[in-house]
Interface confidence: low
């Protein structure tokens, strides 16, 4: 398709060389073409005007993007030829930075009414170049961590090293969607919620006596609860004797839940207690069985192939250790009687 | 630029309490880990601890039960107390950033930013 | 608390050489390691972390390896600002802890 009439935007990408950072483009479609395609929907459904030329169309994925090559090659689907590259709905996301993302970047509606097709497109210019000022590398990272129900700022990592004063108008984007009130190279948050986790993209406009273009920034941002004061508490075995079959398999599974720590290295184990020796087993791995904010709950199993005599003279010790301390739980197997 | 720079006594009694602070400039101290590390003349680095913005803080063991880190957002500082001090205390005392370095799923802490040092010595 | 070992204390080599340093862990710390560059009466300087990411205005020539426990930093041809010493850390749990470092002297 003809793309010398689509819209065109450039934007600068400097990616810090020490973190594996994200980029996102945006199909800034023109209005009021846009509206109809992306969740950044300006028009309530009852507002969209009538002319719109793309009606039908209510897929939020329903735009298609291509790189147009350097050497004149025709448009290429970036869903083919780029696997680094993803497309969500209507932003294209960049998982690593790298000088060879620099390019022309085109996205338009896959359905199209042939009247509009050269209107409806917008060309994205995107130039990627690591940073070069060493000191500002320390300045603001592109993964923040905000502590749920304290007071945080998120940083414009493109704009942290200059100060508040100097800095220029600031747009917002939080997972895609605009800030409209957020203007400046912070957003200050007076408390912190679980919703304020998300990804935020940050762009200002830089201009010299030729051009100007957008330089843009995407920062992840978690919410963290503090660092538990807690050992892991172990939710099962809860009983310290197990009725059993001679002859059969067993499995007795150990779950434990581990409190929220920065640098997380949970032990779950299992060890067997026979009169004055002790022995650690060797079971399958532990698995992640539920995971939020606060807490992590982790469970290893142990399995036996089949339940001897000898197993019911031992002690099966689960034993889970954080960074606080540990907990045991041991389980003494009976014979089932009757 | 993030700068720090430490700040305090460089004489301290025995059995007295050692107090340092440390200044942030060129950046907010919200949304990081901020450490002290210790150094005694001629040895290696030891770790005391950390300090959230939010208050949050994780010490070493070692010192536990001597060491308190608090911080000020309104003065961009962060401080360390260590109580009943001895000789073994002498030290240069740094105070540094602890920053995660995204990785894809994780991230891997490094202390990037560190002050110049402020050389504590215990003696009566 | 994991140990860090480095290996050797110190050594002594000429600018050009290639040097490499070893650190061991007590037990697995996974990529979870970083290495520090200190110069007499600086502070320490950030080079490495998760083992063999080399921070940026790092030179090529240094380089780190490993995981589990144990871990290198090569500098591939020496020179003459490189004379230091060096400490490897761990992140991977609580209580962070340092090597006792490598003392790189000129021969």
């Known amino acids: 398709f003809n793309i010398s009439g689509c819209s065109t935007k450039k934007l600068l990408w400097t990616y810090s060389t020490r973190s594996e950072e994200e980029f996102v483009l945006f199909c800034d479609l023109p209005e009021p073409q846009k509206s109809h395609f992306c969740h950044r929907n300006r028009l309530s459904p009852k507002q969209v005007p009538e002319h719109l030329p793309f009606m039908g169309s209510n897929d939020l994925s329903d735009v298609q993007w291509y790189q147009q090559p350097s050497n004149g090659d025709p448009l290429e689907d970036i869903r083919k030829s780029y696997p680094h590259i993803i497309q969500d709905k209507c932003t294209l996301h960049f998982l690593t930075p790298g000088v060879n993302n620099s390019g022309s970047y085109i996205c338009r509606p896959k359905m199209i009414k042939s009247p509009y097709d050269v209107a409806c497109c917008v060309k994205m210019i995107l130039e990627v170049k690591p940073q070069t000022n060493a000191s500002c590398e320390y300045s603001a990272s592109h993964k923040q961590d905000l502590l749920l129900g304290s007071t945080g700022s998120i940083s414009c990592p493109s704009l942290s090293c200059q100060s508040d004063a100097q800095s220029p108008a600031v747009t917002w984007y939080k997972n895609g969607k605009l800030l409209s009130v957020e203007r400046s190279n912070r957003i200050v948050v007076d408390e912190v919620y679980d919703y304020h986790q998300g990804t935020y993209v940050c762009d200002y406009t830089q201009s010299d006596t030729v051009s100007s273009w957008t330089v843009r920034a995407v920062v992840q941002v978690r919410t963290i609860v503090g660092d538990t004061k807690l050992k892991p508490d172990i939710l099962d075995p809860v009983e310290d004797t197990l009725e059993v079959e001679l002859g059969k398999p067993l499995t007795i599974s150990c779950k434990a839940r581990f409190g929220f720590e920065r640098v997380f290295n949970p032990v779950i184990k299992w060890y067997i207690k026979d009169s004055d020796l002790e022995w650690e087993v060797s079971v399958p791995e532990a698995k992640s069985i539920k995971s939020t904010l606060k807490d992590e709950i982790i469970e290893r199993n142990i399995i036996l192939e089949k339940v001897t005599q000898r197993d019911l003279r031992r002690k099966f010790v689960c034993f889970v250790q954080n960074s606080i301390g540990n907990t045991t739980q041991s389980v003494q197997l009976k014979e089932k009687r009757g | 630029q993030v700068q720090l720079q430490e700040s305090g006594p460089g004489l301290v009694k025995p059995s007295e309490t050692l107090s340092l602070t440390c200044t942030v400039s060129g950046g907010s101290i919200n949304n990081y880990y901020w450490s002290w590390i210790r150094q005694p003349p001629g040895k290696g680095l030891e770790w005391i601890g950390y300090i959230f913005y939010s208050g949050t803080t994780n010490y070493n063991p070692s010192l536990k039960s001597r060491v308190t880190i608090s911080v000020d957002t309104s003065k961009n500082q962060f401080s360390l107390k260590l109580s009943s001090v001895t000789a073994a205390d002498t030290a240069v005392y740094y105070c540094?950033?602890?920053?995660?370095?995204?990785?894809?799923?994780?991230?891997?802490?490094?202390?990037?930013?560190w002050g110049q040092g402020t050389t504590v010595t215990v003696s009566s | 608390a994991i140990q860090l070992t480095q290996s050797p204390s110190s050594l002594s080599a000429s600018v050009g050489d290639r040097v490499t340093i070893t650190c061991r862990a007590s037990q697995g710390i996974s990529s979870a390691l970083a290495w520090y560059q200190q110069k007499p009466g600086k502070a320490p300087k950030f080079l490495i972390y998760e083992a063999s990411s080399l921070e940026s205005g790092v030179p090529s020539r240094f380089s780190g390896s490993g995981s589990g426990t144990d871990f290198t930093l090569t500098i591939s041809s020496l020179q003459p600002e490189d004379f230091a010493t060096y400490y490897c850390?761990?992140?991977?749990?609580?209580?962070?802890?340092f090597g006792q470092g490598t003392r790189l002297e000129i021969k």
């Open positions: 540094a950033r602890d920053v995660g370095i995204a990785a894809r799923n994780s991230y891997y802490y490094v202390m990037d930013v």
């Open positions: 850390q761990q992140f991977n749990s609580y209580p962070i802890t």
